[in-house]
Amino acid sequence: KGMHAAQPAVVLASSRGVASFVCEYGSSGNAAEVRVTMLRQAGSQMTEVCAATYTVEDELAFLDDSTCTGTSSGNKVNLTIQGLRAMGTGLYICKVELMYPPPYYVGMGNGTQIYVIDPEPCPDSD
């Protein structure tokens, strides 16, 4: 009756502060427009990192945002978050909404814990 979104439990960001993961949702079969929202949970607070609506048949990059980029293929969305720092470590939740045509469905993943380790500064060399 509901819709579930699946995402990996843990992802380690690269040394450049980039983290990618796939968010997969159970498709009703006829969704033409899907909205994907990335939420970051810190304690009881949930903040929106980025969001975009994409057309399923286009299967093109869909997030036009400085923080996130993404591509879609069928009921899978490959999300990439950039510019992460150690303070960005946290639980990132993928929310998927089937916006059109009806019926409207919404599903949320259990979250991906992204670990960000700031690179050590290079020692000065004379």
Epitope: K1, E33, M99, P102, P103, Y104, Y105, V106
Partner: antibody, heavy 114, light 110 residues
Framework: EVQLVETGGDLVKPGGSLRLSCVAS????????MNWVRQAPEKGLQLVGG????????YYTDAVKGRFTISRDNAKNTVYLQMNSLRAEDTAVYYC???????WGQGTLVTVSS | QAVLNQPASVSGSLGQRVTISCTGS????????VAWYQQLPGTGPRTLIN???NRASGVPDRFSVSRSGNTATLTISGLQAEDEADYHC???????????FGSGTQLTIL
């Protein structure tokens, strides 16, 4: 703050036409499909139809098919409901709503009577 | 017009608990989600319970929902004066291929 404001409701004779507008603000309008819903006096809500985010696809409930047309202008953050061949049973308050039902407008009254 | 059945009215005293039922069929509530809306006099509906069964943003936890078979129930506990309003349920009907709504229930605070 998200706002949806419907306008254009009026008293019209049977067989007449009317165009309703719904102006949106406070959210990325062009990213959202939109619905129109109506509520006849002392009756429940009824879906009229909807339109996708780009305006290229619409759907309608059987009661209005062929008579009503939904369109949108994303540059103006506005969705429209063109109503033709109006009947007494179309008398209702008409609401626009985002397709995820998160937000609704306050409604505009359409009265069809001779 | 209304496909889902709701009681025309319910009432309760301040602080009390009331329930509003919404009965459908195996092609709507029995097979799909149920959302709930609150409508104050002279205003448009406001979503109380989203289609995933969760409360909409800003809705207090006094509002809760349950479902059994083809019937969904909205429970409002600790009634407050501002809860006096009409309440509507909705679901997707897989036979009619449209959203169906309840007839609406008027809640009166005694």
């Amino acid at each position: 703050e998200v706002q949806l404001v419907e306008t254009g409701g009026d008293l019209v004779k049977p067989g007449g036409s009317l165009r309703l507008s719904c102006v949106a603000s406070g959210f990325s309008f062009s990213s959202y499909a939109m619905n129109w819903v109506r509520q006849a006096p002392e009756k429940g809500l009824q879906l009229v139809g909807g339109i996708n985010s780009g305006g290229s696809s619409t759907y309608y409930t059987d009661a209005v098919k062929g008579r009503f047309t939904i369109s949108r202008d994303n540059a103006k953050n506005t969705v429209y409901l063109q109503m033709n061949s109006l009947r007494a049973e179309d008398t209702a308050v008409y609401y626009c709503a985002i397709s995820n039902w998160a937000y609704w407008g306050q409604g505009t009254l359409v009265t069809v009577s001779s | 017009q209304a496909v889902l059945n709701q009681p025309a009215s319910v009432s309760g005293s301040l602080g009390q608990r009331v329930t509003i039922s919404c009965t459908g069929s195996s092609s709507d509530i029995g097979k799909s989600y149920v959302a709930w809306y609150q409508q104050l006099p002279g205003t448009g509906p406001r979503t109380l319970i989203n289609v995933d069964g969760n409360r909409a943003s800003g809705v207090p936890d006094r509002f809760s929902v349950s479902r059994s078979g083809n019937t969904a129930t909205l429970t409002i506990s600790g009634l407050q004066a501002e809860d006096e309003a009409d309440y509507h349920c909705s679901s997707w009907d897989w036979s009619l291929h449209t959203y169906v709504f309840g007839s609406g229930t008027q809640l009166t605070i005694l």
